[in-house]
């Protein structure tokens, strides 16, 4: 914390301007009135403050707004945003997409994924749902940021908005997020024809259940290995050799290359070796011929 001193009369601050860059930390602390700073926040970003000086300004705002900054201040934070922690941001109430855009621009190129995720979360809470305008802003200014939202927040996306989501916006989504987004995408694209549907649904398939993957195997989609390996392990394991062969089409030989990666490895272990042999890829590790498979989990459920 900055030690308290009284402000020398000649250093008194009546407006936020470039002269402040010559103030020492303790002078800034003593001479800058927090209310004046808040009122003239729009000037701060144009002044080349050091990171140490920005620490003092942040401390001023924290004292003035212990419950969290108002949006009028947040909108003009500029490089001061780089000083904010997720805990600071969690106190904010943000509804304006202009505020979101401004701060996303500032954070670009900085290690701020936790702060950005928290900011986006606050915007979604502030606006009540993840509407089309918010999604458009995220896709334009922060590709991949959509996936920083929790599954709970993503559940507020209306299916009608899914069309605005591009494949690259889903790159960083995990299975739990895709579990939420996939049913919405399925609904959004349900009226499309086979090949067009597959192109659209492909980025969301990490959330698809087995029955939907089985259905795709009947549609000559020629799924690439990267998409196959992004499928949920639980969705892949029940697929038969014939279904996987149909699903992958000419890409089936890629199974050999990825045979040690999950979920390919796990799927191979569940297949009969003589079924795997029909692929002619030299895949090994299947259930030997003549072995009986007992599903003990079923027996336990019955007892």
């Amino acid at each position: 914390d900055v030690e308290r001193t009284t402000c020398p009369p000649e250093k008194e601050v009546h407006e936020i301007d470039e002269s402040l860059i010559f103030y020492k930390k303790r002078e800034l602390e003593a001479c800058v009135d927090a209310a004046l700073l808040a009122a003239q926040m729009d000037r701060v970003d144009a002044i080349p403050f050091t990171y140490e000086q920005l620490d003092v300004l942040k401390h001023k705002l924290d004292e003035l707004y212990p419950q969290g900054y108002p949006e009028s201040v947040i909108r003009h934070l500029g490089h001061l945003f780089l000083k904010m922690s997720p805990e600071d941001i969690r106190k904010w109430n943000v509804t304006s997409l202009e505020t979101l855009k401004a701060l996303l621009k500032v954070s670009k190129g900085h290690e701020m994924s936790a702060q950005v995720a928290t900011l986006i979360d606050r915007v979604v809470v502030g606006r009540g749902q993840l509407d089309k305008d918010t999604v458009d802003t995220l896709t334009a200014f922060c590709p991949g940021c959509l996936c920083s939202l929790s599954p709970e927040r993503l559940s507020s996306v209306p299916p009608s908005v899914i069309g605005a989501v591009r494949p690259q916006d889903l790159d960083t989504c995990g299975p739990r997020q895709l579990d939420v987004l996939y049913p919405k995408a399925r609904l959004a694209f349900q009226n499309m024809s086979g090949s067009e549907y597959f192109v659209k649904i492909r980025p969301f398939l990490g959330g698809a259940p087995t029955e939907d993957v089985k259905a795709l195997s009947q549609q000559n989609v020629s799924m690439d290995l990267a998409t196959f390996m992004k499928l949920r392990r639980e969705a892949v394991l029940p697929l038969t050799v014939a279904e996987v062969q149909k699903l992958l089409g000419p890409h089936v030989e890629g199974l050999k290359v990825e045979e040690q990666h999950s979920p390919v490895r796990d799927w191979i272990l569940k297949q009969r070796q003589d079924d795997l042999d029909t692929l002619g890829l030299g895949l090994q590790g299947g259930i030997p011929n003549g072995y009986l498979i007992l599903d003990l989990s079923v027996r336990e459920a019955l007892s």
Epitope: P167, Q168, D171, T172, G206, D224, L225, A226, F228, M229, K230, H251, E253, G254, L255, K256, V257, E258, Q260, H261, S262
Partner: antibody, heavy 119, light 108 residues
Framework: EVQLQQSGPELVKPGASVKIPCKAS????????MDWVKQSRGKSLEWIGD????????IYNQKFEGRATLTVDKYSSTAYMELRGLTSEDTAVYFC????????????WGTGTTVTVSS | QLVLTQSPAIMSASPGEKVTLTCSAS???????LSWYLQKPGSSPKLWIY???NLASGVPARFSGSGSGTSYSLTISSMEAEDAASYFC?????????FGGGTKLEIK
Amino acid sequence: EVQLQQSGPELVKPGASVKIPCKASGYTITDYNMDWVKQSRGKSLEWIGDVFPYNGDSIYNQKFEGRATLTVDKYSSTAYMELRGLTSEDTAVYFCARRKTGTGYFDVWGTGTTVTVSS
Amino acid sequence: QLVLTQSPAIMSASPGEKVTLTCSASSSVSSTYLSWYLQKPGSSPKLWIYSTSNLASGVPARFSGSGSGTSYSLTISSMEAEDAASYFCHQWSSYPYTFGGGTKLEIK
């Protein structure tokens, strides 16, 4: 333009560790595997292992198992190779290389990071 | 592990000459799973030929690849100065993936 940018040379002491970053740009990192290859001075190439960035699943050449760890930060599109318990035998250039999932060839290579192990 | 042996280790060729580099595998490799890389001093390797005979993007048509089983080759129909480099074959038919020891091709 697709690029894999690696960090500059590293001088490390025997027994120490090194973590080499490989920053991918110009493509979607989760659509390709990232492999790592070692090249000792004036020698051939040696495959270390690979990682599937979507889920972080990695596999290793047995020779490097237990000493090498391959990871990916999807948010920054950066892959990392950490090598522990370094000896003079580990002095080499280390390359990251992009591999289209389902194929085994490396269509884009990183710039290479020279690691020198010396006391 | 599957061993790839390249021969010769070093060779030189005159401009316009036909050049053949060979790569011999210790056990059979499917032609889908063999590739070649070119590397010049101080540079990273570059994909040159994949799946035995497919030329990578930007590779001149004077290059070709062929082979099956345990015997593979890379051929330059007419050697040019810019072809001087080290060439490595590589298999991904079985783990661990392996590379040949390389052939250093020089211009006379």
